[in-house]
């Protein structure tokens, strides 16, 4: 029985050409988590965090993407293009998979900001 | 006592292939990611490829991606590195190292004595 | 990939001379920063994991420190068997890259 729920930065906000953190957090379980994915709306991935061999950035994201803080991914030189849905998916022992998604805006404007509150989608 | 011991090497043409071996033993194998990390005449370390204890997780440096493939065999406590099209540049000592150990911050804490690869005509 | 720049990249000094090694990394790794010792025709032994912890077996001489993208590993006092090349490796993302190297030789 999956117990766990994923908390998420939510619908989040940033400017062009600055960067951002996209969080997940699992909660409510004693899973042990094998592997987190970041991907992005188009399906694509970005990186990996294997709890075993740490982070691996794709090739077409290295320039643009960070890994962490903890288990989150920084994005970086941020275009109108990064607008979209982003989706951290957990890998767990025994409970199986649970996915969360952030819906990042990017802004034209220099006076966006960035709104970082957690919630459960 | 922990041991690697590596085989397999030797002189091949530009263009041919080699299957390089690592036992393993005095640990429990198939709980413990794996690396290969080369090192040329005289230059430093480069790392080449890790692989997760089930072997579900494989990563390459990208100047070996595409032609070197990296696998285990835990009933057999066994390393392997399949190098197909090989260059003169691939030619070097080949350790395999266990670890790295993400989620334990570890290194790669042991060692085997290295196997020479030649790769000439 | 994370780049990893060591210096100097070799030095000279004395049985009993304190010694220090700096690694940099191009992006934050926290703590996931190693060294390893090599001697010529051997493999490397790891010394220091997580950029501060003692490797079991390895003398207290050896110690690390630093974090984030900023990484030192000190011998305390040198002894004739700790003249080798050291590297610094992070182990955060894939390429698990190393720096340079430091060729530790006698004066």
């Known amino acids: 029985m999956m117990t766990g729920t994923i908390e998420t930065t939510g619908n989040i906000s940033a400017k062009k050409g600055g960067s951002v953190i996209l969080q997940c957090h699992l909660s409510s379980t004693m899973a042990q988590v094998t592997q987190v994915n970041w991907e992005q709306h188009d399906h694509s991935l970005l990186a990996i965090r294997n709890a075993e061999l740490g982070w691996h950035i794709y090739p077409a994201f290295k320039d643009r993407v960070a890994p962490g803080p903890g288990l989150g991914l920084t994005l970086q030189s941020l275009t109108m293009n990064d607008t979209g849905e982003y989706f951290c998916t957990y890998h767990t022992y025994p409970d199986g998979t649970y996915r969360g998604r952030i819906f990042l805006e990017v802004l034209e404007s220099s006076v966006a900001e960035h709104s970082a509150r957690f919630q459960i989608p | 006592e922990v041991q690697l011991l590596e085989s397999g090497g030797g002189l091949v043409q530009p263009g041919g292939s080699l299957r390089l071996s690592c036992a393993a033993s005095g640990f429990t194998f198939s709980t413990y990611a794996m690396s290969w990390v080369r090192q040329a005449p005289g230059k430093g370390l480069e790392w080449v490829s890790a692989?997760?204890?089930?072997?579900?997780?494989?990563y390459y440096a990208d100047s070996v991606k595409g032609r070197f493939t990296i696998s285990r065999d835990n009933s057999k406590n066994t390393l392997y590195l399949q190098m197909n099209s090989l260059r003169a540049e691939d030619t070097a000592v080949y350790y395999c190292?266990?670890?790295?150990?993400?989620?334990?911050?570890?290194?790669?804490?042991?060692w085997g004595q290295g196997t020479t690869v030649t790769v000439s005509s | 990939d994370i780049q990893m720049t060591q210096s100097p990249s070799s030095l000279s000094a004395s049985v009993g001379d304190r010694v220090t090694i700096t690694c940099r990394a191009s992006?934050?790794?926290?703590?996931?920063l190693n060294w390893y010792q090599q001697k010529p025709g051997k493999a490397p032994k790891l010394l220091i994991y997580?950029?501060?912890s003692l490797q079991s077996g390895v003398p207290s001489r050896f110690s690390g420190s630093g974090s984030g993208t900023d990484f030192t590993l000190t011998i305390s006092s040198l002894q004739p068997e700790d003249f080798a090349t050291y590297y610094c490796?992070?182990?955060?993302?894939?390429?698990?890259?190393f720096g340079g190297g430091t060729k530790v030789e006698i004066k």
């Open positions: 997580a950029a501060s």
């Open positions: 190292a266990k670890g790295p150990r993400y989620q334990d911050r570890a290194g790669m804490d042991v």
């Open positions: 992006q934050s790794i926290s703590s996931y």
């Open positions: 490796q992070q182990s955060l993302a894939t390429p698990y890259t």
């Open positions: 692989i997760s204890g089930s072997g579900g997780s494989t």
